[in-house]
Interface confidence: medium
């Protein structure tokens, strides 16, 4: 019968012959007399075999990732009467792994969205890295991950490429953050292979600020010849929010004279003084509001941000209309 | 800190002119609005004259309207009272005062300048 | 315009004691728009009190104001001897005008 152990090459050999191993029949007495052949893809061009001795040898530079094992088949003849001395049998040459490829992201481009100010512990995206080396040849394909840029405010799980959010972040100082994952391979042992991946993060805006009068004090002025429902002016708060959570309402929160209101204009976010009584120069020439903003909405959880409202002071000076030149402060 | 300093003060015949001012310092004098207030001697205070921040408008006593003009210069930091017609009961320390950003009291005074009319 | 009439228009007292002064407003001061000052001689007035009841920078706290409407008070509650002095009450709500000034003396 046929006498082989299994057969193992080493992918990426760079000698120009590698010694496979040697298949023989255990009626060959090492008198020459018998004749090996190798047949099948592969045979002659990426094998050959010694036709005397049976040694098979790689003659090629092998790749495990484009061919992982060959299946060839053997021959045996005695030359003396030309006839199979064994009968024709098949056999597998395999293709051992080396750590030859680098981690692979596959995804790529990365990019999530966290709400800012999201906790600690807060999940954002998993990352994957692909081996394209043996999972089941040691710790060639065997993955760890880690942060190359992005503390402190996240970490990477190193065996699942979860990023988690480990410091609290805030949109109105930066609201992008670019993290780069590393992937080893080789458990990150000496000899690691490795890949990067950028990962856009985008925070979310959740109102956690509350809006604040551009000014402490604004002065207008208004004729006593002004109607009521007249426009005299406007005051204007900001808020470092955005979209929704930058609405806001504009309020009177004290005028004992019960004569001007204030409106909000929702396009512009202004708040707009309204005469509501007549005024009379020589009755009172000047008035002082204290007016109000908050913001529109407002959820419950983020109501500690938004106690005590911003005010702002409104002088408002009297015109009168009978005597031009007696303006007043 | 704040510092007003009134100058100007003197002298004058019935029907003559005089023109008071008061250097401020120590504050920004383009955000305040600032009056005249003047004390005859021996008697109380009696508020002059006040012009706007911005210097648009302007707002007298009867006592003096048509006859005093309040102005400022930002430039110089100096406010202005230029007086006009004088008469003998104009006679006072005049006082410079700026009014307090969020109500219309006076929280600073000069040392104030003395106007004598008399002939 | 809003005249207004202060009491006494002396008040005899000793260092120590408490000072009581009025300031009666012809209509009424709208927003408590009154405010006290003090004239010590050969100097400028000094404001002590606004808006009727709130203590100026640097104040010291035996000054206190109250009232609302017509009826104001300025309440010394121990004097000091720099306490003696002139003190004016004005009003702001309507133009500006002040009281004829209550002279506290040392007795």
């Known amino acids: 019968g046929w006498v082989w152990n299994q057969f193992f090459v080493p992918e990426e050999m760079n000698t120009t012959s590698h010694h496979v191993g040697r298949l023989r029949s255990d009626l060959d007495n090492g008198n020459n007399s018998f004749q090996y052949k190798l047949l099948g893809a592969g045979a002659g061009s990426t094998f050959i075999i010694d036709e005397r001795t049976g040694d098979i040898y790689a003659i090629e530079k092998l790749d495990r990732e484009e061919r992982s094992l060959y299946i060839l088949r053997a021959q045996v003849i005695d030359i003396t009467t030309g006839r199979a001395v064994e009968p024709e049998s098949e056999f597998v040459i395999k293709v051992s792994d080396i750590n030859d490829n680098e981690p692979k992201f596959l995804d790529e481009p990365y990019e999530a969205i966290v709400p800012e100010m999201s906790p600690e512990g807060t999940l954002v995206i998993q990352v994957t890295a692909s081996d394209a080396d043996d999972p089941s040849s040691g710790n060639n394909a065997r993955l760890l991950y880690s942060l190359l840029q992005g503390q402190p405010y996240f970490s990477v799980e190193p065996t699942t490429g979860v990023i988690r959010i480990s410091s609290k972040m805030d949109r109105e100082l930066q609201d992008e953050y670019w993290v780069i994952i590393q992937a080893k391979d080789m458990i990150g042992q000496p000899g690691a292979l490795s890949g990067t991946t950028s990962v856009l993060i985008k925070l979310s805006d959740v109102n956690d600020n509350k809006p604040i009068f551009k000014e402490s004090l604004y002065r207008l002025t208004v004729s006593e010849s002004a109607p009521t429902g007249t426009s005299i002016g406007t005051i204007m708060a900001y808020d470092n929010d955005i979209g929704e959570n930058a609405e806001m309402d504009y309020s009177i929160e004290e005028d004992d004279s019960q004569t001007f209101d204030i409106i909000t204009n929702h396009e512009t976010q202004e708040g707009i003084v309204i005469l509501k009584k007549k005024v009379n120069f020589e009755h009172q020439n000047h008035y002082g509001i204290r007016a109000k903003v908050k913001n529109h909405h407002v959820d419950e959880q983020l109501m500690k941000y938004h106690t005590e409202a911003s005010t702002t002071f409104i002088k408002i000076q009297v015109e009168d209309v009978d005597e031009p030149g007696g303006g007043g402060s | 800190q704040v510092q007003l300093v009134e100058s100007g003060g003197g002298v004058v015949q019935p029907g003559g002119s005089l023109r008071l001012s008061c250097a401020a310092s120590g504050f920004t004098f383009s955000s305040y609005d600032m009056h005249w207030v003047r004390q005859a001697p021996g008697k109380g205070l009696e508020w002059v004259a006040v012009?706007?921040?911005?210097?648009?408008?302007?707002y007298y006593a009867e006592s003096v309207k048509g006859r005093f003009t309040i102005s400022r210069d930002t430039s110089k930091n100096t406010l202005y009272l230029q007086m006009n017609s004088l008469r003998a009961e104009d006679t006072a320390v005049y006082y410079c005062?700026?009014?307090?950003?969020?109500?219309?009291?006076?929280?600073?005074w000069g040392q104030g300048t003395l106007v004598s009319v008399s002939s | 315009e809003i005249v207004l009439t202060q009491s006494p228009g002396t008040l005899s007292l000793s260092p120590g004691e408490r000072a009581t002064l009025s300031c009666r407003a012809s209509q009424s001061v709208s927003n408590t728009y009154l405010a006290w000052y003090q004239q010590r001689p050969g100097q400028a007035p000094r404001l002590l009190i606004y808006g009727a009841s709130s203590r100026a920078t640097g104040i010291p706290d035996r000054f206190s104001g109250s009232g609302s409407g017509t009826d104001f008070t300025l309440t010394i509650s121990s004097l000091e001897p720099e306490d003696f002095a002139v003190y004016y009450c004005q009003q702001y709500s309507n133009s500006w005008t002040f009281g004829q000034g209550t002279k506290v003396e040392i007795k």
């Open positions: 012009i706007s921040y911005e210097g648009t408008n302007e």
């Open positions: 005062a700026r009014e307090r950003y969020f109500d219309w009291s006076f929280d600073y």
